[in-house]
């Protein structure tokens, strides 16, 4: 087999908290040369085996490279809910993509506060 991507399809996290976005690539033959992370169509970060990690400037205060070839997304807001894509560029063997749906939920503190207010 050329290669496979394994990831959790759906994950959730609390507003204000953090989440790890992780894709696992396995192959007997293909060698990873670069990994791109996207939020919908917007590039979050690039990992190049040669050049290292580069986080898009718009996310640089909230996205931390790692662990491994994943990303840690911090200070989550409700607007961060949506699809995230990892793209593994390999040689030889081409391109492998994984998809994660992140649901950012209202923090438990907010939910408790709202319940008390009602």
């Amino acid at each position: 087999t050329a290669g496979t991507i394994d990831t959790k399809r759906n994950i959730s996290a609390e507003e204000g908290g953090s989440v790890i976005l992780q894709c696992h690539f396995s192959s007997d033959t293909a060698e990873v040369t670069q990994v791109d992370w996207k939020q919908q169509d917007q590039l979050l970060a690039i990992y190049s085996v040669d050049l290292g990690w580069h986080v898009a400037s718009v996310f640089s205060d909230r996205v931390v490279p790692g662990p491994s070839l994943g990303l840690t997304f911090q200070s989550l807001t409700m607007n961060d809910t949506g699809e995230y894509f990892c793209t593994y560029h390999t040689y030889p063997g081409g391109i492998y993509k994984g998809r994660i749906f992140l649901k950012v939920q209202e923090s438990s503190d907010d939910r408790n506060g709202l319940a008390q207010f009602q």
Epitope: T33, Q34, D36, I46, S48, D50, L51, H54, H89, I95
Partner: antibody, heavy 122, light 107 residues
Framework: QVQLVQSGAEVKKPGASVKVSCKAS????????MGWVRQAPGQGLEWMGI????????SYARKFQGRVTMTRDTSTSTVYMELSSLRSEDTAVYYC???????????????WGQGTTVTVSS | DIQMTQSPSSLSASVGDRVTITCRAS??????LNWYQQKPGKAPKLLIY???SLQSGVPSRFSGSGSGTDFTLTISSLQPEDFATYYC?????????FGGGTKVEIK
Amino acid sequence: QVQLVQSGAEVKKPGASVKVSCKASGYTFGSYYMGWVRQAPGQGLEWMGIIDPSGGRTSYARKFQGRVTMTRDTSTSTVYMELSSLRSEDTAVYYCARARTPSSWPYGMDVWGQGTTVTVSS
Amino acid sequence: DIQMTQSPSSLSASVGDRVTITCRASQSINSYLNWYQQKPGKAPKLLIYAASSLQSGVPSRFSGSGSGTDFTLTISSLQPEDFATYYCQQSLLTPFTFGGGTKVEIK
């Protein structure tokens, strides 16, 4: 002003090596990636590789891996491109070019050297 | 490696014409697409980066559009100094490959 000045033309025999220099001035040398691009006579542009002058990390086009070495000297703000085992098809103008954005993924090359002509002939 | 295909390879146009050059990537490159202008015997010059952002000092008659795999460079009103060869380049995945070039000649 921001400037890249390359070394002069070279004539080499097949099998030899050539080392082209590119001296940067007018900006913080370590903050911008430097790429190398070549152009054979009457042909298009060919990307050879790139170097991070601060840490020395490099990425080479697979076509040139094993034959090309890109290095830098931070004390003189100079990057070097050495190409070995030269053949006639390496005859070209070699350009160094600075990446547009500092400390970021190289999004485009905004400042170019004047080019260095390398002729490989027996 | 990502292949970049430009079309046409050459075109003839007159001063004042609207000129469109296209560039297609063999896979999605998001908006990581640059356009360069090169005149004979000179180094290339960056015109457009990130598919549609105009490089400082470049006349506003140059514009870029597209994302994913299909991109366009438009010169809204061709000037005498615009006769040159134009190259696209992707900068998402190393090696940062160039298109084959489009030569814009005087009709």
